[in-house]
Structure formats: structure tokens, C-alpha cells
């Protein structure tokens, strides 16, 4: 049998947020149910982890030897202290269109740990703000955004943005 | 490390121009919205210019809007402020600050860089 | 625009003392989202400046638990529970509320009595 170090070793997780609770839930993407030592895991989710507080957790399996898999769970940041927001300008609307993620509040995860995405079309671009110019008027522009914690996406958003007529003569 | 480090500070005359530069390291330059602030002889602070991380967004106080100008380059992990029309009165040690976004906190500073404006 | 009115211009005391410093806005800078962006700096001679204490009263990373942060309003106060010779040096209230009018106030010198 392998070590459960092992046989874990590159495990993954997903990290799923609850509103109400403003906790985490991670996810721990493995095939088999496991165990997970002193943190109680349910059909292999970590409940209740508070934002921006490290988490450990054994993983253990009777396919797999001692020593168990200590994974640290890097929580991310509240979801609610992000939004997606249009800074597009009103009189570039029709050939200009502005996204901006907006920290609403403060936390104390490390800022540096977070990475921002947004695909538009298939233009792909890792910043916090982006401002696509030179587009066609009166066109039907999708951008898909994500946010990412050490790498784990913990959040997402879409914009459908039309953008305005041309101005007559253009 | 996280480091900003200015340059481009000099003597020039009234009515004069002057580029300011602001070298970023050690952390994603392009997540992070960032300000100049400059300190008086008299060591008072005061917020020059502002601008959002992808340079969508520029905020001026009325007493340099019109002659001062921040912009960055996020592919060189710079920040700049150019100054024109430049008064006695905008003789100051520069700093320029980085901030998470508008509802943060000037959490690092450079070492800043001394204009004197002056005939 | 928002003035920051800070006293006094000079504080002088002994190591181990307790120290105060006030800030008063011209006016409330309770933002409409409920949160109070007021901020205090230190910048020690020769120094740039560096955060203390973020919305009223949350210590920054790093910040000795003597510096305390308190006020609401239009009202700030800075504590300093027992003054070591490392905090001698300029102390500043930022206000952040009304963006992008960011506005300093005058400062306040913590020096030996």
C-alpha cells in the first residue's frame, strides 16, 4: 500500500461559500470517501472555515498507510467582498467597455495570494480592471471573470454588456 | 520583497516640467490601485494624484489637476507622474503608495524623491 | 473639501507614559456603506510613513497591541498605552471616506519630555 502522504499528494479542493453563513466549505476532489482526523469531513467536505484562516486537515484511507496527507486549507476572502462593476464611461459606451472587480471591504488574507481573470471573447486578460476600446457599436459583448486564492478559483461572475449606438455620422 | 523606489526628482524653474517615476517589485503591480503623496518643507502630507489598477480611473485635488498627470505601465511595473506648470509651492519630498483599492489603506511607500521648484 | 484638524501639534512625554492624539474632521466621515475610513500613520525621522490603525481602530499587520484606535463621527483618537522610544516620531489621521478627496491631517509630534 502506498502512504497516504502519497497517494494524496497532489490532491485538489474547491472552495464553496455559503451567504447565510459566511463560511467555506472545501470541497476535497478524491474518488473514495476519506477521513479526515481531527477536522470532521462529510462525503469529503470541510465545513465552516472561516475566511482567511488557515485550516489543517489529515487525510487518511484504509487504501493508503500512515502517514496521513496534512493538507493546509488556504481560505479565501468572504465572496461578498468582491464585485463585478461597469466602470464603463457613458460617453464611450458605444465602442468601449470597462470591468473592474471592487474590494467593498477589507480582510486580511494576503492580497498577494490573489489573482483576478477575465475572458471576453477570446481575448484572456489576468487583471483586476480591464478596458476593451475599439469595439463595434451596438454589439452584444460576454465576459466571463473569476477570482483565484494560491490558485483555487472561489469565485465568478458574467456580463453581458450591449454596448450603444454610434453617434449618427459615424 | 515589496519595494517602490522613486526617481526623476530635481531642481526646476516655476513654470517648469518634471516626469516622476515610481519603480514597483515584489508584488502583482497590476492588482493594486496607487497614489502620490507628497510632504511639504513644512512636513505636512498631502495627496497628489490617484489612479485604479488597470489606469481606468484618475483622481486629481484641485490644487494640481489641470497640471499634473498619473498614469502607469503594468508590463514595466511602473507608476509615473508628470508635472507641468509647476509652482514654488509644489516643492515637496514625492512618495507614491500603494493601496488594495479605494476602501483600503497606504500599506507600502517608497523612500520617496525631493522636488524643489525654485528660480 | 474634508480638513483634518489634529492636536496637539507637539506632544511631549515620558517613556512608559500613556499618549493621546486627536483628529477632527470638518465633517462626518461615516461613508454611506456605514464603514468609517479613517487611518493613522507614524513616520519616524528620516522615514517614509507607515499604517498604524485602518478603519477607526483595526491594527494593522506587525502593530505593537499599545496602539489603539477609537472615535466615530466627526472624532478620532489615537493611544499609545505605554510610549517606547521606538514610536517617537510624526503621527498622521488619514481620511479615506470621501473618494477621491483623500486629506491629511497636519500631524502630531511624539517627542521626549
Known amino acids: 500500500k502506498p502512504t497516504c502522504d502519497e497517494k494524496y499528494a497532489n490532491i485538489t479542493v474547491d472552495y464553496l461559500y455559503n451567504k447565510e453563513t459566511k463560511l467555506f466549505t472545501a470541497k476535497l476532489n478524491v474518488n473514495e470517501r476519506v477521513e479526515c482526523g481531527n477536522n470532521t469531513c462529510t462525503n469529503n467536505e470541510v465545513h465552516n472555515l472561516t475566511e482567511c484562516k488557515n485550516a489543517s486537515v489529515s487525510i487518511s484511507h484504509n487504501s493508503c498507510t500512515a502517514p496521513d496527507k496534512t493538507l493546509i486549507l488556504d481560505v479565501p476572502p468572504g465572496v461578498e467582498k468582491f464585485q463585478l462593476h461597469d466602470c464603463t464611461q457613458v460617453e464611450k459606451a458605444d465602442t468601449t467597455i470597462c470591468l473592474k472587480w471592487k474590494n467593498i471591504e477589507t480582510f486580511t488574507c494576503d492580497t498577494q495570494n490573489i489573482t483576478y481573470r477575465f475572458q471576453c471573447g477570446n481575448m484572456i486578460f489576468d487583471n483586476k480592471e480591464i478596458k476593451l476600446e475599439n469595439l463595434e457599436p451596438e454589439h452584444e459583448y460576454k465576459c466571463d471573470s473569476e477570482i483565484l486564492y494560491n490558485n483555487h478559483k472561489f469565485t465568478n461572475a458574467s456580463k453581458i454588456i450591449k454596448t450603444d449606438f454610434g453617434s449618427p455620422g459615424e | 520583497e515589496v519595494q517602490l523606489v522613486e526617481s526623476g526628482g530635481d531642481l526646476v524653474k516655476p513654470g517648469g516640467s518634471l516626469k516622476l517615476s515610481c519603480a514597483a517589485s515584489?508584488?502583482?503591480?497590476?492588482?493594486?490601485?496607487m497614489s502620490w503623496v507628497r510632504q511639504t518643507p513644512e512636513k505636512r502630507l498631502e495627496w497628489v494624484a490617484y489612479?485604479?489598477?488597470?489606469?481606468?480611473?484618475?483622481y486629481y485635488p484641485d490644487t494640481v489637476k489641470g497640471r499634473f498627470t498619473i498614469s502607469r505601465d503594468n508590463a514595466k511595473n511602473t507608476l509615473y507622474l508628470q508635472m507641468s506648470s509647476l509652482k514654488s509651492e509644489d516643492t515637496a519630498m514625492y512618495y507614491c503608495?500603494?493601496?488594495?483599492?479605494?476602501?483600503?489603506?497606504?500599506?507600502?511607500w517608497g523612500a520617496g524623491t525631493t522636488v524643489t521648484v525654485s528660480s | 473639501d474634508v480638513l483634518m484638524t489634529q492636536t496637539p501639534l507637539s506632544l511631549p512625554v515620558s517613556l512608559g507614559d500613556q499618549a493621546s492624539i486627536s483628529c477632527r474632521s470638518s465633517?462626518?466621515?461615516?461613508?454611506?456603506?456605514?464603514?468609517?475610513?479613517l487611518e493613522w500613520y507614524l513616520q519616524k525621522p528620516g522615514q517614509s510613513p507607515k499604517l498604524l490603525i485602518y478603519?477607526?481602530?483595526n491594527r494593522f499587520s506587525g502593530v505593537p497591541d499599545r496602539f489603539s484606535g477609537s472615535g466615530s463621527g466627526t472624532d478620532f483618537t489615537l493611544k499609545i498605552s505605554r510610549v517606547e522610544a521606538e514610536d517617537l516620531g510624526v503621527y498622521y489621521c488619514?481620511?479615506?471616506?470621501?473618494?477621491?478627496?483623500?486629506?491629511f491631517g497636519g500631524g502630531t509630534k511624539l517627542e521626549i519630555k
Open positions: 503608495a500603494r493601496r488594495y483599492d479605494v476602501w483600503w489603506y497606504f500599506d507600502v
Open positions: 515584489g508584488f502583482a503591480f497590476s492588482n493594486y490601485d
Open positions: 489612479i485604479s489598477s488597470g489606469g481606468v480611473s484618475t
Open positions: 465633517q462626518s466621515i461615516v461613508h454611506s456603506n456605514g464603514n468609517t475610513y
Open positions: 478603519k477607526v481602530s
Open positions: 488619514f481620511q479615506g471616506s470621501h473618494v477621491p478627496m483623500y486629506t
